[in-house]
């Protein structure tokens, strides 16, 4: 979109050294050529750019360039060239669900979020027909129904940037030694010694007109013998400019010959550098006393003077001026580049400008939602727009519960379970899934008949100590798990059918853990004396540390797909912070021994995040954005513990790389499991054995013993050849063969080779604390003694 | 300014079904967290929940008349409806229809009808 | 279902400060409303969640509690408070009202 603020100065002969020429001779700074943004208003900024190849997420200009394929047929032209709201490009368009139709002639579609925001994004204005007006009363209404500060109507400027805050305006009479330029036009008045100067100093060059000067007007003339006044310097090149601003620094004239000749700044910190290069004290600056030979230290000081009258100070925007000097500043939505050019601010630098999507024009930005999110006009935050409302579902040990966040409406969705800490939910198909820290089993059952024990299906009830932390993959049909006594993390099919220890090696005390199916990794906290959290592919590969400084207890992390960030509580040090997926922008939410006082689960929805809090036995909600708005949501809860949103828009649907291959299972003849997408080049998935077999050459077929032909792993961390006999026969593998129980021998997998080791006994110290008192540790003991052995939970 | 409005049969005999109306303005049940709420107060009692439909038509039936109860919408005429089937002596009652609010007011409900007094009776 | 119990009447002199009772037999966590009912009038909501304010309510009006036991207090009480006052949880299924208290003047 052009710059609306730009404008209103005269073609230029010759730009300044960061300026680029346009064609119709205006300068405009150099940093905005080739920006996709017409600045010209002749596009010749935008011409002979190096052509893009854009993105397929992009939509490609008939030009080249390349701008966002949802900015296509919006209503806005963001090519140069106009070509993504051609009538080609958008005719029989059907606007989505989340825009708004421009109306039956118009074949456009804005976001919805435009409608009634004070801008005409539609050509006709249909997106602001029908509006009530917005402005308070101390407020003018503008054209384009944005608001403006009434002090801003007829000062001169187009503050609306429609120009209707300066229309109809009575014309201010210029004083008496004053020039109207623009003759009776209303034009800007200037102080009468500036007429006939050889310097435009009218937008329309009246004063220097032929007509009035009586001589042909500025041009290639030469130098003036003298300028109009002795507090100015004469360029080389012909303009006078402010004596003040020789050897200043700054190059003012065309040619730089204000700096050009000047002795070296000799002068001391309280002393005033004259225009010939002599000192004198910096008191003696403007007292209205001739101080400099050449008269500098009072040039501009004259009462009165005006900089901003004469080239608008060489300011790009808004020249203020001051008591001694002026002053360049810019509109709402740009910054000063270099004391004298504005650029455009981008605010979506900012990741929380926006709850979702941030664009970035000149001069201001404007927010969009994702696709089944809907902005709240109030509130200005994607609200999810469709379908069920979202439904808070956690555990307090002994049952799993369910708020609904909009309706508040309360219920228990299993009741009678032994010792709960961990679950997860499948949307798609209505599935709970839960751990048991007393029976040591993974359960799962549909949501509406999960309260009835004999719908609650047994995953997983071997080799089993500690689970703590469960998530479901929703695409790849996975469930993960962390389990804090056999320090290890495992992965199994979500009917518990196969099952894969990934990790065993380097886990003091895994805790929390959350996939991101959509881009292949994993994440789980570990509160043990190093804390951290970590991140792997669902494989298993590409294992690293994201945040190990600190960091105490990280008890539940939370992923927000859509913003690609990891939230976190930590216990000891009652705080809940975020970072990005790569571990960097970290930021800390809220530090609160109040609010976080021993928070265990977090999750996030919208633009709020949700965690409980064992010692306030409560829920708490927050904005996920800055931290502010904290509010309880239910107290009075008794442990409240893993905590999860039901939602169809938290696990958004994804193509199964493993079902879309030729071969079923993606040819792999036990697990298939998605690989991460860290470039285009990554694998879609790898295949895994059981713990108890070894992958073959193929790196799809599962051997009860290594194959003689050595073989090597696909782990990116660590790299073993091993030696190999042959399948033994009759010894084909089926489904029926692979046992639940694992005795932990390596295997070489696509996942983790050498990450699986027998699992050490269990150093866990019980508790002596009871989980209903106040002083929450992080070890409990189990409840159940038939079990004999002591439990690392909640 | 929110308005809800009852309409009913007035009198019916025992077995009839009975259909309210409920005529709502300045709010609309197509707004997320919007609900609409029927109650009712047999004279010199205290009140009782009936049904409510939310605007993702989500509907609850109180378990204590379930299978006699019907709640509807009609969005584009800003209206709600309830039945209630097998009419009985003690239906006899003023029934309210309000607007619920969703989210931190918590299911409150906001804005009430005038109610309309319904009466079975052979 | 969850049993709201309040007292049926209470009789108090203008400008003192009453306090009207609410006790729930289960937990209803901070889920309580109150309400004001006159013959002949639309009820009115004037506590949402236990302590807030419904818009428009006077702020003599205030709730508190917790858990089970929930107390809606006038200070100072004005001649036209005179009503029932119903106390309302929505946290179990189904929403149930309590039994209204009558607030008389003396």
């Known amino acids: 979109a052009a710059d609306p603020l730009l404008g209103g100065q005269g073609p230029a002969k010759d730009c300044e050294k960061d300026q680029f020429q346009c064609r119709n001779e205006r300068c405009i700074p150099s940093v905005w050529r080739c920006d996709e943004d017409d600045d010209c208003l002749d596009h010749s900024d935008e011409d002979d750019c190096p052509k893009k190849t854009c993105a397929d997420s992009d939509f490609t200009c008939d030009n080249g360039h390349c701008i966002h394929e949802r900015w296509k047929c919006d209503g806005e032209e963001e090519c140069p060239d106009g070509s993504d709201e051609s009538e080609a490009t958008c005719t029989k368009q059907v606007c989505p669900a989340e825009k708004l139709s421009c109306g039956p002639t118009s074949h456009k579609c804005v976001p919805a979020s435009w409608r009634c925001d004070g801008e005409k994004d539609c050509e006709g204005g249909a997106d602001e027909a029908g509006c009530a007006t917005l402005c308070a009363p101390h407020e003018f209404q503008c054209g384009n129904r944005s608001c403006l500060a009434a002090v801003f109507v007829c000062d001169g400027d187009d503050d609306c940037g429609d120009g209707s805050d300066e229309r109809g305006c009575a014309d201010p009479a210029c004083g008496p030694r004053e020039f109207r330029c623009g003759g009776d036009g209303g034009g800007a008045c200037i102080p009468e010694r500036w007429v006939c100067d050889r310097q435009f100093d009218c937008e329309d060059r009246s004063d220097e007109a032929a007509e009035l000067c009586g001589r042909p007007g500025p041009g290639a003339t030469s130098a003036p013998a003298a300028c109009a006044t002795a507090s100015q310097f004469a360029c080389r090149s012909g303009e006078c400019v402010h004596l003040g601003w020789r050897c200043d620094g700054d190059r003012d004239c065309k040619d730089k010959s204000d700096e050009a000749d000047c002795p070296l700044g000799t002068c001391r910190g309280d002393e005033f550098q004259c225009g010939d290069g002599t000192c004198v004290l910096a008191i003696k600056h403007c007292n209205q006393e001739q101080d400099c030979p050449d008269g500098s230290d009072e040039a501009g000081c004259l009462q009165g003077l005006n900089e901003c009258l004469h080239n608008n100070g060489g300011c790009s925007h808004i020249c203020t001026d001051l008591k001694i000097g002026f002053e360049c500043t810019c509109p709402a939505g740009f910054q000063l580049l270099d004391q004298k050019t504005c650029g455009d601010i981008d605010e979506c630098k900012d990741p929380d400008a926006c709850s979702q999507i941030c664009v970035n024009y000149k001069g201001y930005f404007k927010c969009e939602c994702y696709p089944g999110y809907e902005m709240d006009l109030l509130t200005k935050n994607c609200k999810a727009a469709a379908g069920k409302s979202p439904s808070l579902i956690f555990t307090n040990r002994h049952e799993v519960r369910r708020i609904d966040l909009v309706k508040r409406n309360y219920s228990r969705l299993i009741p009678m379970l032994k010792n709960v800490v961990a679950l997860d939910v499948e949307v798609a198909t209505n599935r709970i899934y839960w751990c048991d820290l007393s029976y040591r089993k993974i359960y799962s059952a549909y949501m509406d008949k999960a309260s009835d024990p004999k719908e609650q299906e047994v995953l997983i009830d071997e080799q089993l100590h500690s689970p703590e932390g469960l998530a479901v993959d929703w695409v790849h049909k996975h469930i993960y798990w962390t389990d804090s006594g056999n320090k290890t993390i495992s992965v199994a099919t979500v009917d518990g059918g196969r099952r894969r220890t990934l990790f065993s090696r380097n886990l003091s005390e895994p805790r929390a853990i959350a996939v991101d199916p959509l881009r292949g990794f994993m994440y789980w906290s570990d509160w043990g004396d190093q804390a951290k959290i970590e991140k792997s592919g669902l494989n298993g590969v590409d294992r690293q540390t994201l945040v190990s400084d600190n960091i105490e207890w990280p008890n539940g992390i939370t992923l927000d797909l859509l913003s690609q960030r990891l939230y976190w509580v930590d216990s000891k040090l009652h705080q809940l912070s975020s970072i990005d997926f790569s571990g960097g922008n970290r930021k800390t939410l809220i530090s609160s021994t109040d609010f976080l006082s021993h928070p265990f689960g977090i999750a996030v929805f919208e633009d709020k995040v949700f965690w409980t809090d064992l010692e306030n036995e409560a829920i708490f909600s927050a904005n996920r954005l800055n931290g502010l708005e904290i509010s309880i949501l239910a107290e009075n809860l008794n442990n409240p513990h893993d905590i999860v949103i039901f939602h169809e828009l938290k696990q958004p649907r994804a193509p199964d790389a493993c079902e879309l291959s030729v071969q079923p299972n993606g040819g792999c003849e036990y697990l298939c499991l998605p690989a991460p997408q860290i470039s285009s080049h990554s694998p879609k998935y790898t295949c895994a054995c059981p713990d108890t077999m070894w992958l073959g050459p193929d790196m799809k077929r599962c051997y009860r013993a290594p194959q003689s032909t050595s073989t090597t792993t696909l782990a990116s961390t660590m790299t073993r050849t091993v030696p190999a006999t042959t399948r033994a026969p009759g010894t084909t593998v089926h489904r029926s063969t692979y046992q639940n129980h694992s005795t932990e021998t390596p295997s070489l997998t696509a996942a983790v080779p050498s990450s699986v080791s027998v699992p050490r006994a269990p150093s866990i110290s019980p508790s002596t604390l009871s989980p209903a008192t106040s002083n929450h540790s992080q070890h409990y003991a189990n409840e159940d003694s038939k079990m004999g052995s002591t439990v690392t939970a909640a | 300014q929110v308005t809800l409005k009852e309409s009913g049969p007035g009198i019916l005999q025992p077995s009839q079904t009975l259909s309210l109306t409920c005529t709502f303005s300045?709010?609309?049940?197509?707004?997320?967290?919007?609900?609409v709420g029927w109650v009712r107060q047999p004279s010199g009692k205290g009140l009782e929940w009936l049904a409510n439909?939310?605007?993702?038509?989500?509907?609850f039936y109180n378990p204590s008349l379930k299978n006699r109860l019907t709640v509807s919408k009609d969005t584009s005429n800003n209206q709600a409806f309830l039945r209630i089937t097998n009419g009985d002596t003690a239906d006899t009652a003023t029934y309210f229809c309000a607007r619920i609010l969703g989210e931190d007011i918590g299911g409150a409900l906001d804005a009430w009808g005038q109610g309309t007094s319904v009466t079975v009776s052979s | 279902d969850t049993v709201l119990t309040q007292s049926p009447a209470l009789a108090v002199s203008p400008g003192e400060r009453v306090s009207i009772s609410c006790r729930a037999s289960e937990g209803v966590n901070s889920y309580m409303h109150w309400y004001q009912q006159n013959p002949g009038q639309q009820s009115k909501l004037l506590i949402y969640r236990t302590s807030n304010l419904a818009s428009g309510v006077p702020a003599r009006f205030g709730g508190s509690g917790s858990g089970t036991d929930f107390t809606l207090t006038i200070d100072p009480v004005e001649a036209d408070d005179t009503a029932t006052y119903f106390c309302q949880q929505s946290w179990n299924d189904p929403p149930t009202f309590g039994g209204g208290t009558k607030l008389e003047l003396k």
């Open positions: 300045g709010f609309s049940l197509n707004t997320y967290g919007m609900g």
């Open positions: 439909i939310w605007w993702d038509d989500d509907k």
